[in-house]
Interface confidence: medium
């Protein structure tokens, strides 16, 4: 049999070897495709089959606009003038070249020594699905699950049957390297079909700023508050990327998700204690602030009344 590859939407002609110049009953096409249940028989005298395929006077089979459902096996059996039976067998596959792939949400800047999303490569409208691959400085980038992580997703359009591919690249660039050039290419995996390439992106690589010291700011100043007042603790640190901040009271971590602000409304004596914050930086490890002592006393500065906080986002959880 012969393998045929045809582009979706284009006509396909399959010739029937040995067909007489003026076909008689002695020519028959059989097809088994996504449109048929098992084998469908077409003969020259038969009506055109749903305008999908018809036998031409010379015995060839014409599919005016081939689609995904026309993938399958096509067989012709003809008897030539000498009475000898000649068979033709075709295995038909279809393809669709997608639009040019593109990198969406490209990073303009990467931070060394920490994982960074470079961008998401998107290809729309392919058949078969094909593959996306990433390149660094023109060379294939092999995911290793650590410094180079690729997350892939393939979706099929429910009506057209065409595929959309997405590939998200996350890298951990080394310090002191050159400016990298990332690109992505789509390949259908068919012979003689060149890959389609995205425009390259060149994000800058920024050295991570080591934490310059961590400050714990307390309101009211001094940390002394009257019962029923509000205490706001803010952990200030200049580092890139921003670290995660956890809170400690009397040496014990508080049951809160990371946040740079800790709000204590309507304080009572049970809130008294030594508070500190810990900044956890991916490339520099944890760093603890100097502690502050929160005291609740009748003579202390009047803390902000609990009902007067304006909802400015000061809270005990980070997004």
């Amino acid at each position: 049999g012969q393998n045929i590859t045809a582009r979706i939407g284009e006509p396909l002609m399959l010739s029937c070897k040995g067909a007489p110049k003026k076909p008689t009953q002695k020519l028959e096409w059989k097809l088994n495709t996504g449109r048929t249940e098992a084998w469908k028989v077409l003969s020259p005298q038969g009506d055109p089959w749903d305008s999908v395929a018809r036998i031409l006077p010379n015995g060839s089979l014409l599919l005016p606009a081939i689609g995904i459902v026309d993938e399958g096996t096509f067989r012709c059996r003809a008897t030539n003038r000498l009475g000898k039976e000649v068979k033709s067998n075709y295995r038909v596959r279809v393809y669709q070249i997608p639009g040019k792939p593109e990198i969406v949400n490209p990073a303009s800047e990467l931070t060394a020594n920490v994982p960074n999303k470079v961008g998401t490569c998107v290809s729309e409208g392919s058949y078969p699905a094909g593959t996306l691959s990433w390149h660094l400085d023109g060379k294939p980038l092999i995911p290793d699950g650590k410094g180079t992580v690729v997350k892939e997703e393939t979706r099929r359009h429910p009506e057209t049957g065409l595929f959309t591919l997405r590939s998200e690249l996350t890298v951990t660039p080394a310090q002191g390297g050159t400016t990298p050039t990332y690109s992505c290419s789509f390949s259908l995996g068919l012979p003689r079909r060149r890959p389609l390439n995205t425009a390259p992106i060149q994000p800058r690589v920024r050295e991570p700023l080591p934490p310059e010291g961590i400050q714990l700011l307390v309101e009211p100043e001094g940390g002394t508050v009257a019962p029923g007042g509000t205490v706001t603790l803010t952990c200030a640190i200049s580092a890139q990327p921003p670290p995660q901040i956890h809170w400690i009271k009397d040496g014990t971590p508080l049951p809160l998700a990371p946040s740079p602000v800790l709000l204590l409304p309507e304080v009572g004596h049970e809130d008294e204690g030594i508070y500190s914050c810990v900044a956890t930086h991916p490339s520099h490890g944890p760093q603890e602030s100097p502690p502050v002592n929160i005291r609740v006393t009748e003579t202390g500065d009047e803390g902000q009344a609990a009902g007067s906080v304006d909802g400015s986002g000061l809270g005990t959880l980070a997004l």
């Epitope: 049951p255 998700a257 304006d310 909802g311 809270g315 997004l319």
Partner: antibody, heavy 117, light 109 residues
Framework: QVQLQQSGAELVRPGTSVKVSCKAS????????IDWVNQRPGQGLEWIGV????????NYNEKFTGKATLTADKSSSTAYMQLSSLTSDDSAVYFC??????????WGQGTSVTVSS | QAVVTQESALTTSPGETVTLTCRSS?????????ANWVQEKPDHLFTGLIG???NRAPGVPARFSGSLIGDKAALTITGAQTEDEAIYFC?????????FGGGTKLTVL
């Protein structure tokens, strides 16, 4: 006085979503966290997650990631929990509770969600 | 996931002192578990009693107190009253989530 008023009982079809509300009154909404907890018929309590109404920050029990979505509307002092792709396993009474750092003090009256075809 | 275990039922008399406990499958309960105690009365009426191991919630009578006893968290009711008949749940914090115990049904006869 502090009150958490939850929305009424829901009877919903499998595969659909439901949104339960929890309206807070009697205190400064953004000063406290709102935890969500469920109780299945004849079972104990299970923590779903928490939202900080001031910042919108959330923290979920891994088991409920993708199932529950917590939001809050500061202007109406209301917290919401949306449950998606419901199955009969999600039939339970759902509670909101106010939390001050480490203490869940006030609780809503509960919202019964029944998933049935 | 950790399992939190409580006595399934306890009975006491009015005026008596009763202690409910809360054990963790991961080892000793510590202040880092921020034990909470919650009371459930009929019709899903929940009230927070204790948080952070030993901090009474607002408006909770002084007869309720929280502590650590040995390797467990404990809720002590000193001078139980008939209205204390309820189910009591404890909750423990494990790094990033809370786990509740199965509850203790307290009967005050």
């Amino acid at each position: 006085q502090v009150q958490l008023q939850q929305s009424g009982a829901e009877l919903v079809r499998p595969g659909t979503s439901v949104k339960v509300s929890c309206k807070a009154s009697g205190y400064a909404f953004t000063n406290y966290l709102i935890d969500w907890v469920n109780q299945r018929p004849g079972q104990g309590l299970e923590w779903i997650g928490v939202i900080n109404p001031g910042s919108g920050g959330t923290n979920y029990n891994e088991k409920f990631t993708g199932k529950a979505t917590l939001t809050a509307d500061k202007s109406s002092s209301t917290a919401y929990m949306q449950l998606s792709s419901l199955t009969s396993d999600d039939s339970a009474v759902y509670f909101c509770a106010r939390r001050r750092v480490d203490t869940m003090d006030y609780w809503g009256q509960g919202t019964s969600v029944t998933v049935s075809s | 996931q950790a399992v939190v275990t409580q006595e399934s039922a306890l009975t006491t008399s009015p005026g008596e002192t009763v202690t409910l406990t809360c054990r963790s499958s991961t080892g000793a309960v510590t202040t880092s578990n921020y034990a909470n105690w919650v009371q459930e009365k009929p019709d899903h009426l929940f009230t927070g009693l204790i948080g952070g191991t030993n901090n009474r919630a607002p408006g909770v009578p002084a007869r309720f107190s929280g502590s650590l006893i040995g390797d467990k968290a404990a809720l002590t009711i000193t001078g139980a009253q008939t209205e204390d008949e309820a189910i009591y749940f404890c909750a423990l914090w494990y790094s990033n989530h809370w786990v509740f115990g199965g509850g203790t049904k307290l009967t005050v006869l």
